[in-house]
């Protein structure tokens, strides 16, 4: 049978027809529709949006569209007992209180159900004490405080600036340092780009703007009460004391107007160096406590949020494959937002909507993809990737046997400078080839390819003439598919110029000011960057679902494995005497990488030569490609992180957003010089080298000739 069974359109025309059907004007219209009211997870408004999307995907022509619901732990402020922070005098009187809400943006003054800024899953509590400024609250910031400056955070309330690392890691670090509360704030150094006005006159964060966000340390567990299993009708739920990843100390976020009031009184130690100073007109003293005149004043937190088991809804759409219906290519992004979701997530959801519409149009004309495409609108991403994780837990047996690829579709933009891609090495060549076929939307690159503008603006640090492609970390819905299940994954969006814009993320991230107007006025008035992202995401899905041979190149994995082995060996070489003393050798890992390289090369040669008209051999070769990512999964998981099972990549233990290579070895080596029992510590390094070497060798063997 033809690989293009059930279609009357030639393969080349299919992709062109699909891409030509994508329209910027539709993405704009969908974004407007999705951003007029808040769609907080667990609310009626978000349930209604789920039903609307279900209905529209059916109209667009998908074969089936179902809601998948779960009852998961969410967190909300107490409506009658607001959260705030005070400065109190020696008599306990509150002489300053932080704001209870963000001033609403123009045109939104009468919108109800805007959740006030809060740190989701903070426990309740009213701690009071002296303040310690801890910079970004990174691991290295606490090392600086405790080891170099001899400042003890035990029993203190710490204030940390947002940025650099995931907020949950900041809270975990503060807890480990003995803090009794955490205040998170947005410093203008990180969230106010020079020369740009604050919203509504520009895209910068105003002083009253605040970043919401969860502060969990789930490590891939999903719903905190049902780790490993779906939160369905008959689920057994842990007690709250046994829940996964919940913080143990109160946490609350504030804007820089309020932060100024807390930081301007700080005394104690001066900042250790300029990297600890932000852009406020305050000394950035570390503390503890306030200066002489104010030394009797304390800070008090008032946190009354509650954790509640609440129903959430994913929308799952299916476009059945004509030839290999049991092979799934998944395009998923979340629907829930903190408030209006102008960028996060609806700039992504609008793109998914238009991709579904385009696929539906082709299907109505008689076309079907070769493989099944699943479309997902995830719920409760903002509360810990809950919707995607619960669905994957429920469907794990199908996914691990049938999952070809997962393409993530959260925010389409975080800037308008160039493309940004994070993906498995298996997709490098797919991304390169696709972007060479797409037009660049960038000024000054008219008539040039996206590949060309991307490579010029974001060059690879290793390979000249190629663009930078980053490792997958976490903090988004691909996590369960890639880190737990080992399904090849990727993500793409338009980003800022990291060279000139040093702020973290985009300034209005997770604030009330993330509106439709923010995107339409300041980021992408013509929606040309959104369209480009739709073409990249949609094009990847199209190729993955429709190409006869899967568009994966295993040789690219070989290249990065060598690079990662070099990197981890370089880290270990900082301890040459210990390596000698404890007989630590990386030879097994380098040998495995060498074998992988040779076997991958031979596999690629066979891939060029085999008889593609033989459906059994075709399926066999494609299965070897599909299961290669799966081969990097260790069923036992990483130490103390059972749901991070990928041996080559995991979210950094110090920053969930960042990817770490050979994470087991990396974590075993981290701060090893401070370990109480060096023999045990180096024994664990050796064990992790063994696990990594075995896994790489085992993965290589999956590419060998089968008999």
């Amino acid at each position: 049978k033809s690989s293009n069974e059930a279609t009357n359109i030639t393969p080349k025309h299919n992709m062109k027809a699909f891409l030509d059907e994508l329209k910027a004007e539709n993405i704009k219209k969908f974004l407007y529709n999705f951003t007029q009211i808040p769609h907080l997870a667990g609310t009626e408004q978000n349930f209604q949006l789920a039903k609307q999307i279900q209905s529209q995907w059916k109209e667009f022509g998908l074969d089936s569209v179902e809601l998948a619901h779960y009852d998961v732990l969410l967190s909300y402020p107490n409506k009658t007992h607001p959260n705030y922070i005070s400065i109190i005098n020696e008599d306990g009187n509150e002489i300053f209180n932080t704001s209870l809400f963000e001033p609403p943006p123009p045109g939104y003054e009468n919108v109800s159900d805007i959740v006030p800024p809060f740190s989701a899953f903070s426990p309740q509590g009213m701690p009071e004490g002296d303040l310690v400024y801890v910079n970004y609250a990174r691991t290295e910031d606490f090392f600086k405080l405790e080891r170099d400056m001899k400042i003890n955070c035990s029993g203190k309330i710490v204030i940390a600036r947002y940025g650099k690392v995931f907020r949950g890691n900041k809270v975990k670090n503060a807890q480990l340092a003995g803090a009794k509360g955490v205040i998170l704030y947005s410093d203008p150094a990180d969230y106010f780009a020079p020369g740009v006005k604050s919203y509504p006159d520009g895209w910068n964060l105003p002083g009253g703007g605040v970043q919401r966000g969860n502060i969990l340390n789930l490590n891939g567990a999903g719903d905190p009460l049902t780790p490993g299993y779906p939160a369905n009708e008959y689920a057994y739920r842990r007690g709250i004391a046994e829940a996964v990843g919940l913080p143990s100390i109160p946490v609350h976020p504030i804007g820089y107007y309020d932060a100024q009031k807390l930081l301007e009184k700080m005394g104690g130690s001066a900042p250790p160096d300029s990297s600890w100073r932000g852009s406020l007109k305050v000394p950035y003293n570390v503390g503890p406590g306030f200066t002489g005149n104010f030394s009797t004043q304390k800070v008090k937190m008032h946190i009354h949020s509650t954790n509640e088991v609440t129903r959430i809804y994913n929308v799952i759409g299916t476009l059945r494959g004509a030839v290999e219906p049991d092979r799934y290519v998944i395009l998923g992004g979340h629907r829930d937002s903190w408030v209006f979701g102008g960028i996060d997530p609806q700039s992504g959801a609008a793109v998914v909507h238009e991709i579904v519409r385009s696929f539906g149009t082709l299907k109505k004309e008689g076309w079907r993809p070769r493989r099944t495409i699943l479309f997902a609108s995830w719920d409760a991403e903002e509360f810990g990737l809950l919707g995607s994780t619960e669905w994957a837990e429920e469907n794990s047996r199908l996914l691990q046997e049938r999952g070809v690829a997962y393409i993530n579709a959260d925010s389409s933009i975080e800037g308008n400078y160039t493309l940004r891609v994070d993906c498995t090495p298996l997709m490098y060549s797919l991304v390169h080839n696709l972007t060479k076929e797409l037009k660049s939307p960038d000024e000054g690159f008219e008539g040039k390819s996206l590949y060309e503008s991307w490579t010029k603006k974001s060059p690879s640090p290793e390979f000249s003439g190629m663009p930078r492609i980053s490792k997958l970390g976490s903090g988004n819905d691909f996590e369960v598919f890639f880190q737990r299940l080992g399904i090849a994954s990727g993500r793409a969006r338009y980003t800022k110029n990291w060279e000139t814009n040093k702020f973290s993320g985009y300034p209005l991230y997770h604030s009330v000011y993330e509106t439709y107007e923010l995107v339409e006025k300041f980021y992408d008035p013509m929606f040309k960057y959104h369209l480009t992202v739709a073409q990249v995401r949609g094009g990847m899905v199209f190729e993955l679902a429709n190409s006869i041979v899967l568009p994966f190149d295993c040789r690219d994995y070989a290249v990065v494995l060598r690079k990662y082995a070099d990197k981890i060996y370089s880290i270990s070489m900082k301890h040459p005497q210990e390596m000698k003393t404890y007989s630590v050798s990386f030879d097994s890992l380098f040998s495995a990488v060498k074998n992988f390289t040779e076997i991958a090369s031979k596999f690629s040669e066979r891939l060029q030569d085999f008889d593609k008209s033989n459906p059994i051999v075709l399926r066999m070769m494609n299965d070897q490609l599909m299961f290669l990512e799966r081969a990097f999964i260790d069923p036992l998981g990483l130490p103390d992180r059972p749901f991070y099972r990928h041996v080559i990549y995991a979210p950094s233990s110090h920053n969930k957003y960042a990817g770490e290579s050979f994470p087991g070895i990396y974590d075993a080596l981290f701060d090893i010089e401070s370990k109480v029992d060096p023999s045990k510590a180096w024994g664990e390094v050796k064990r992790q080298i063994y696990v990594a070497a075995f896994t790489v060798q085992a993965a290589a063997e999956t590419l060998s000739e089968v008999a």
Partner: nanobody, 118 residues
Framework: EVQLVESGGGMVQPGRSLRLSCAAS????????MHWIRQAPGKGLEWVAT????????EYVDSVKGRFAVSRDNAKNTLYLQMDSLRAEDTATYYC???????????WGLGTLVTVSS
């Protein structure tokens, strides 16, 4: 055959400078990170510096930061260590270490002795 050969060591007074070289042969030098390791008389091995593939990224042990600079010339297959403001405690045999694709085990040079003494 994969080989690393250090040179440039010698006796020097405190405060003066020396430049060590390490010539690589038998492998694609530009593809790999390279390291300088030292061993003071009667002491254990100590990492000094690492330079990554393209030469744009390097790292140093705290005790030499601001005084030593590692560099590489990929065209000449050579690694360098510029040592300024030398101190008595820098006295050691300096080894150049790398890994080559042809070799599973790390490759060490024979070392070059640096003696800092007044």
């Amino acid at each position: 055959e994969v080989q690393l050969v250090e040179s440039g060591g010698g006796m020097v007074q405190p405060g003066r400078s020396l430049r060590l070289s390490c010539a690589a042969s038998g492998f694609t030098f530009s593809s790999y990170a390279m390291h300088w390791i030292r061993q003071a008389p009667g002491k254990g091995l100590e990492w000094v510096a690492t330079i990554y593939q393209d030469g744009s990224e390097s790292e140093y042990v705290d005790s030499v930061k601001g005084r030593f600079a590692v560099s590489r010339d990929n065209a000449k297959n050579t690694l360098y260590l510029q040592m300024d403001s030398l101190r008595a405690e820098d006295t050691a045999t300096y080894y150049c270490v790398g890994r080559a694709s042809a070799s599973i085990t790390p490759v060490w040079g024979l070392g070059t002795l640096v003696t800092v003494s007044s």
